[in-house]
Each structure stands twice: as C-alpha cells, then as structure tokens.
C-alpha cells in the first residue's frame, strides 16, 4: 500500500536503532572519504527529520522519496566539491539521474588504510566508554571500504561484534577470548561482502534475468522440497530486495528483507523443514540464518529429468509457449537434484540446454535432434570436476604457499599486463581456495571451489574495469557471467605480450626481509616471481623451480648470516646473474 511518508513508514517498520545504522551505512557507502563525525551529524539530522514525519506525515518534505531526501542532504554538504570532485556534478541532475550518478561514483577500491584492529585493551576501553558510538564506528569503517556490503547483514555482523566485546571485555584474558571471535567475524564478513558484490554486478552488468537464474539455482539447491512456484515467488521478492540494496535504497531493502523472512517463516511447511530453527530468532539473526541455512534433504522418488525435458514430445511447444518459465523449471529441477554442483555449472548446463532447444526446435524433427542432449552436456560437468581434481592434487603436493606460487606463474602468463601487486593479490586469494575447499568431502569440493572462484574473479573484473590493461581479461569479464571461470581457465600464455626488460631492482633484496612477518615475506618473494615471469613468460616449469630453489637458498643463507646486509649485497648480484643464465 502507498504511504504518505515513505521515511516515516520505514522508521516505524525498522525501529530507531536499525534505522540509524542503515542511514549511517548509506552515507558511508556513498561518501567514503568523509570523517565519522560528519556522518554522525547527518545521521542525527535525518533521524530527527524522520521522527518529525512520524509525528506528522503531512509535514514539509515528508512526502519526498527517501533517495531524494538523501540526495538533498548530500548535495547540501558545503565541502562536497573539494572533497569529492566531480561527484558534486551529480547535484545538477534531477532524480532518478542524480541517484544513478551517485552510484557510479562509488569506489570499490578506495584509497584508505587497512582497517587495523587495536589491541584488546584499547578496544575494550573504547567499547565501554560508548558502545553505540563504537559500533557506529565499525559500521562506518566497514561501509566505506565495502560500498556494496549487504546493509542488513552488516547490522547483523555489528551485533555479533558487539556481543563478542560484551562477553570478552569481562574476561581475564581478553585477547584469547576476542581474537578467534573477531577473526571469525572478519572472515565471514569479507565473504559476505564479496557475495553481495557479485549479486550487484550480476544485476548491474548482466540484468535481472541473470540474477533471477542465479537465485533459482541457489534456492532450488537449498529447498529441494519446495515447488517451483514457491521458489519463483521467493526469487521475485529476493530480486527486489537485492536491487534495492545494490541501488543504495538501504531502508527499503532492509524492510523488504524483513518481510521476505516473515513470508518464508509463515510458509515454512511448503519451503523447508530447516527453517524452523531460524524462524524463532529475532529479526537480524532470522534473516541471516535463512541466508546461511543448511540445504534440506532431497525428496525421495524424483523422476528422471529426461522424462520432462527430453522424452516428452511437448518440449518445443512448452519452450515456445513460455520460454523463461520452461527454462526456469529445467534449472529448478536440475539444481534440486544436484546440490553438489556449483551455481556456475548449473547455469552453464541450463544455457547449454537452451541453446540445444533453440537449434533443435527449429528443425523438422526436434526430438531426434535433442534426444542426446544430456550426453552432449556432460563436458560441462566433466571440465570443472577434472579441474578441481587436478588443482587439489597440486595443492596437496605443494601446500598453500607453493600452490599460490604456481597460480602466480599461471595467471601472470595469462594476463602479464596486469600490475604485479594485483597478480600477487589474486594468486594468493585463488591459492587460499585450496585451503578452504580441497579438504572438504568430494560432494562439497566442486561447488565450494567454483563458487569461491566466482567471487574472486568478480573482484578482479570490477577492479580491471576501472583501469583496463588486458583485452583478454576484459573479454572474459564481460562476455558472459557464467562463463567467466571457464574463460579464465582456457587462457594460456599471452602470445601478444612483449616480455618486460630485465630490471635488477625487481630482484634486489635487503636484510629487512628477514624480520618481516611470514605473510609479508611471502608477498615479497611472490612479487619477484611475478616479475620473473613477466621477464620470461615462456620459461619452463623446471627453469622456474630451479630459480625459486636458488632464491630460497639465497634468502635462507643471508638471513642466517651474522652480517646479513653484507651477504645480501655480495650474493644478491650473483643470484641475479645465475637466474638470468638459468632462464636464458
């Protein structure tokens, strides 16, 4: 139903606490450079205004759209142009163009220092002084670094953060209590951020149909007992919620998400038996629980897929009469039977089936043409299975660091134009997928690997779009969302690349490397490795092994030496000469 005042409606639905949190997230995600204090001031102004509208929905400006109210607030900031430059030009536009303009200025890679965690004592002191302000600061710092973070989920993580501090700040050993809890929150929040970023990219770059297909596959895997009609209803609501959050309409998004959770709990009998444990929880936990829910057991006695999608003489008629419904049904039926497949695989299979029908239904004897469709789709299943098996074998053999090195070489050969720090960052991220997924049982390995790779490649694509350097990367990123991973996997050595001239500076090390934490030491070595590949992209595996072995021996020798710097100065040039000879 239509409300006189949208902002009053959302304030009433969400309550003051969540309302303020969401306003803070909205401002922090759009104005990523502004200090916390400025945002707090604006949050209080918006909240006071909303309260006035609750008291009198007909009061001045209360009838305006929320996005317009936010836009007006932003455009009234006196220092907007000097802080944000051309973002201020958005203010000359009318809504909805102004909203779109603001969105385009969100920065996925803001130039902000890493979000460092203070010592437990300092954390607890600040928390006890003013816990609302402390949690507000957490929302602000996360939001400005992750401008597409799923806002209602961020409120959930803030609540978890608050609970951890409430408990651990009373503990005798604060660090022992806090560290594992905060590490777990951080890791989960980073995955959540990447998942939402993929959803927004899917909607923004590939459209609603792509997002709906993704959602049908995921929900069908989780709720295999639900009917297709029920899945479709949820997907329609979920699409609305996701569009709102991706579009920066966070109050509407959070409110509609609450409504969706309520609907699912009211209809849990026709969705999933697993919802029971979620539906007794309070608002934020309820929606989070549903998002993370374990998949339901498969219904017994499911008929063979071929019955409806191959043997049935009505296939082309059904395809012609309601193409999206028919393909949606295929995706639903296939996904609920295959919880072990990744979303990407399921969507590629559905795409392959669609392409086959497009071809066969135009023939005089369609059935003869599509009779073997499932056999023809088998390579779409075999390829990722084989890839995961090979990579997990390599991971088991080399360990995480060695596996990262192998990936650094592989990806530098695929896209040598990409900057060295970026290649190292992605080799490390891709390598960590081995740690996350390779130890899982066979049934979970495949989906774990491909679903994580989709998140990492999406981040790569977003950053590459900002500063494109490789046509091959652009092609893999933009042609098809579901074929991104196979596209990157299929890239080999870039034959068009002119090797980088040899710079001794890239391979010069000093004694300071010896005292670096292990992670930073690895990054330094991996930077050198990437530079080496850029210099000799066609070097063999054996040559690379030799060079890396010499390099490790050199570092060990000099870091163990009494006069470390002298060792580096003397042996460094010898190592560089030896490496050049090995690679010649």
């Amino acid at each position: 139903e239509a409300h006189k005042s949208e902002i009053a409606h959302r304030f009433n639905d969400l309550g003051e606490g969540h309302f303020k949190g969401l306003v803070l997230i909205t401002l922090s995600q759009h104005l990523q450079k502004s200090p916390f204090e400025e945002h707090v001031k604006l949050v209080n102004e918006v909240t006071d205004f909303a309260k006035a509208c609750v008291a009198d929905e007909s009061a001045q400006n209360c009838g305006k759209a929320i996005a317009t109210l936010f836009g007006d607030k932003v455009c009234a900031i006196p220092s907007l142009r000097e802080t944000y430059g051309e973002l201020a030009d958005c203010c000359a536009k009318e809504d909805p163009d102004r909203v779109e303009c603001f969105l385009q200025h969100k920065d996925d890679n803001p130039n902000l220092p890493p979000f460092e965690r203070p010592e437990p004592e300092a954390l607890c002191t600040a928390f006890k002084e003013n816990n609302d302000r402390f949690i507000g600061h957490y929302l602000y710092e996360v939001s400005r670094r992750h401008p597409y973070f799923y806002a209602p989920e961020l409120l959930y993580y803030a609540e978890k953060y608050k609970n951890a501090l409430t408990e651990c700040c009373e503990a005798a050993d604060k660090a022992a209590c806090l560290t594992p809890k905060l590490d777990a929150i951080k890791e989960k929040a980073l995955v959540s951020s990447a998942q939402q970023r993929l959803k927004c990219a899917s909607l923004q770059k590939f459209g609603e149909r792509a997002f709906k297909a993704w959602s049908v596959a995921r929900l069908s895997q989780k709720f295999p007992k639900a009917e297709f009609a029920e899945i479709s209803t949820i997907v329609t609501s979920l699409t609305k919620v996701t569009k709102e959050c991706c579009h920066g309409d966070l109050l509407e998004c959070a409110d509609d998400r609450q409504e969706l959770a309520k609907y699912m709990c009211e209809h849990q009998d026709s969705i999933s038996s697993k919802l029971k444990e979620c539906c007794v929880k309070p608002t934020l936990q309820k929606a989070h629980c549903i998002l993370e829910i374990q998949r339901d057991e498969l219904p017994t006695e499911l008929p063979d897929l071929a019955v409806d999608f191959v043997e049935d003489k009505e296939v082309c008629k059904n395809f012609a009469e309601a193409k999206d419904v028919f393909l949606g049904t295929f995706l639903y039926e296939y996904s609920r039977r295959h919880p072990e497949y990744s979303i990407g695989m399921l969507l590629r299979i559905a795409k392959g089936y669609e392409a086959k029908l497009e071809k066969c239904c135009a023939e005089a004897d369609p059935h003869a043409c599509y009779a073997k469709v499932f056999d023809e789709l088998q390579p779409l299943i075999d390829e990722p299975k084989k890839l995961v098996q090979q990579n997990c074998e390599l991971f088991d053999k080399l360990g995480e660091y060695g596996f990262q090195n192998a990936l650094a070489v592989r990806y530098t050969q695929k896209a040598p134009q990409v900057s060295t720090p970026t290649l190292v960052e992605y080799a490390r991220k891709l390598g960590s997928v081995g740690t996350k997924c390779c130890s899982l049982p066979e049934t979970e390995r495949l989906s774990c690997t491909e679903n994580y790779l989709a998140l990492i490649l999406n981040r790569l694509c977003i950053l590459h779009e900002k500063t494109p350097v490789s046509e091959r990367v652009t092609k893999c990123c933009t042609e098809s969302l579901v074929n991104r991973r196979p596209c990157f996997s299929a890239l080999h050595v870039d034959e068009t690349y002119v090797p980088k001239p040899f710079h001794a500076d890239s391979f010069t090390f000093h004694a300071d490397i010896c005292t670096l934490p292990e992670k930073e030491k690895q990054v330094k070595k991996q930077m050198a490795l990437v530079e080496l590949v850029k210099h000799k992209p066609k070097a063999s595996e054996e040559q690379m092994k030799t060079v890396m072995g010499d390099f490790a021996a050199f570092l060990k020798k000099c870091c163990d030496a009494d006069n470390k710097e002298a060792c580096f100065t003397e042996d460094g040039p010898k190592l560089v000469a030896k490496c050049q000879a090995t690679l010649a």
Epitope: C316, K317, F319, A320, C361, E363, P366
Partner: nanobody, 115 residues
Framework: DVQLVESGGGVVQPGGSLRLSCAAS????????MSWVRQAPGKGPEWVSS????????LYADSVKGRFTISRDNSKNTLYLQMNSLRPEDTAAYYC????????SGQGTLVTVSS
C-alpha cells in the same frame, strides 16, 4: 500468448483436394519447426507431417507421403498443408502444433472425406 488458428477444412469427395492454413502468433514463428497432427473420431492423435523453421526440411507419415505437402510462409507467420488424393481414412480434425507436439493448442479444422 501463443495462438494457433487452423482453417480450410470442409467436406470433400474421395480423390479431391483441400488446403489447410494455420495462422500463428505469440512466439517467434521462424525459430520453431511446425507440425500437422490429426485426430479421427474415437481415436488418439496421429502425427501427419513436420517442417523446419526455415522451411528447408520436411517429414511425412507413410500414410500421407506423396499426397500431402507441408509448407510455410514465414513473412505471414502461416503454416499450410496441401492435401491431394484425399481418402475416407483421412477424415479427422486437423491441428497445427509447435515442434513435434501431439497435443493441440488451437481448435482445429474438420476434414470430412465422403462420397
């Protein structure tokens, strides 16, 4: 919505001819092979003939081969069945269908072959 409207049926003597038409709408006509199916009183549906989306390939049931000709005009979204040398056993309701479907979408058109 998909719509198939058949026309051109009637009463004809054995050995006579008829031309059936099927006007299609609500889908991309050129992307689908089309078929004619018939159903005699008290019997199940029987496939008669099919044609590819481009019109280049045709298939016929043995019972009509050499007597019936299927064709299509993609510019008019229309499917045709030219029936020559009609026999009493050709008496049936004729339906056009999408792909190899045997179930009808339209109302059909009645062909009666009788002296």
């Amino acid at each position: 919505d998909v719509q198939l409207v058949e026309s051109g049926g009637g009463v004809v003597q054995p050995g006579g001819s008829l031309r059936l038409s099927c006007a299609a709408s609500g889908f991309t006509f050129t992307s689908f092979g089309m078929s004619w199916v018939r159903q005699a009183p008290g019997k199940g549906p029987e496939w008669v003939s099919s044609i590819s989306g481009s019109g280049s390939d045709t298939l016929y049931a043995d019972s009509v081969k050499g007597r019936f000709t299927i064709s299509r005009d993609n510019s008019k979204n229309t499917l045709y069945l030219q029936m020559n040398s009609l026999r009493p056993e050709d008496t049936a309701a004729y339906y056009c269908t999408i792909g190899g479907s045997l179930s009808r979408s339209g109302q059909g058109t009645l062909v009666t072959v009788s002296s």
